[in-house]
Amino acid sequence: REAAPKSYAIRDSRQMVWVLSGNSLIAAPLSRSIKPVTLHLIACRDTEFSDKEKGNMVYLGIKGKDLCLFCAEIQGKPTLQLKEKNIMDLYVEKKAQKPFLFFHNKEGSTSVFQSVSYPGWFIATSTTSGQPIFLTKERGITNNTNFYLDSVE
């Protein structure tokens, strides 16, 4: 039976959700007037870059769009971007597609996503609404790197 990605709404501790704005992901308050993305998550079958201490290796995509999250260096800084790619195309590749890979680790009831390409860099939201989802190596008060994955049908 072919694997299928799991679907989640994603939310942080300040009740900010991820929203698609053009071809970018931004954080916005959970409200009736905005449509949060549904995140597609599927495990990578290739174990080349695996590190159990850091979590399970996963690909992250946007449900209903051929868009996946990936990491690239821009002006010397690891940056989170969306790339036109079907998550299942990544899944069926025999070799792990490193820029698209994240370590998914559970911390209590929250999830943390660390870039496989750039160890120590985590997906984060700012404390300010309307800002892009980004990568940070500063985990703490000013950046939120812990997310709730809410099951959606």
Epitope: A9, S13, M16, P29, L30, S31, S33, P36, G108, S129
Partner: antibody, heavy 122, light 112 residues
Amino acid sequence: ELQLQESGPGLVKPSETLSLTCTVSGGSITASNTYWGWIRQPPGKGLEWIGSIDYTGSTYYNPSLKSRVTISVDTSKNQFSLKLSSVTAADTAVYYCATGKYYETYLGFDVWGQGTLVTVSS
Amino acid sequence: ESVLTQPPSVSGAPGQRVTISCTGSSSNIGAHYDVHWYQQLPGTAPKLLIYGNDNRPSGVPDRFSGSKSGTSASLAITGLQAEDEADYYCQSYDYSLSGYVFGGGTKLTVLG
């Protein structure tokens, strides 16, 4: 139909711990995307949010009460509870439990218990 | 003092239209979190009247409507009836407090 019912002592002595339970019927306390809250109303005054717990077990507390509040869930009894320590007369109020769903009521509370009056007095 | 500010009281004659304001800040209403309104009849628990700024739960008459702009929101009641006499509360979420916040409440008196 989802219903909530508060229970607990109506009289608590100063400096003691107030303990209340909210029993959920007509639905599961572990239902996805659900949050459960405690709100109080001192006599003749307005509503004050005390704290919440959600289906993941995450707790959120009013900063002004945080040092004294604990909210927990008992899934086997389909209940959630409030503990408020070191109470004073200022904690005398009607205590309500309430609930909502993240992606349906958008951080509002659509079902409330009837409320229970707790008096702090020696 | 409440995080959200409401007038303590408003009044109107039967059949009239009244509005109740709710003023917040850039960390709650102004941050685009939704505003919800509750009606509390004397001696009863609050009841959700408006959710998500302008949506009525089933069973709430269309005489009640909500709106939001900037850091403020308002509840409008048209065709005022004696049974509308109650306390009304607005509520939102505040990211700086990581919690839910209420207005101080507004007592609506139906005259006559």
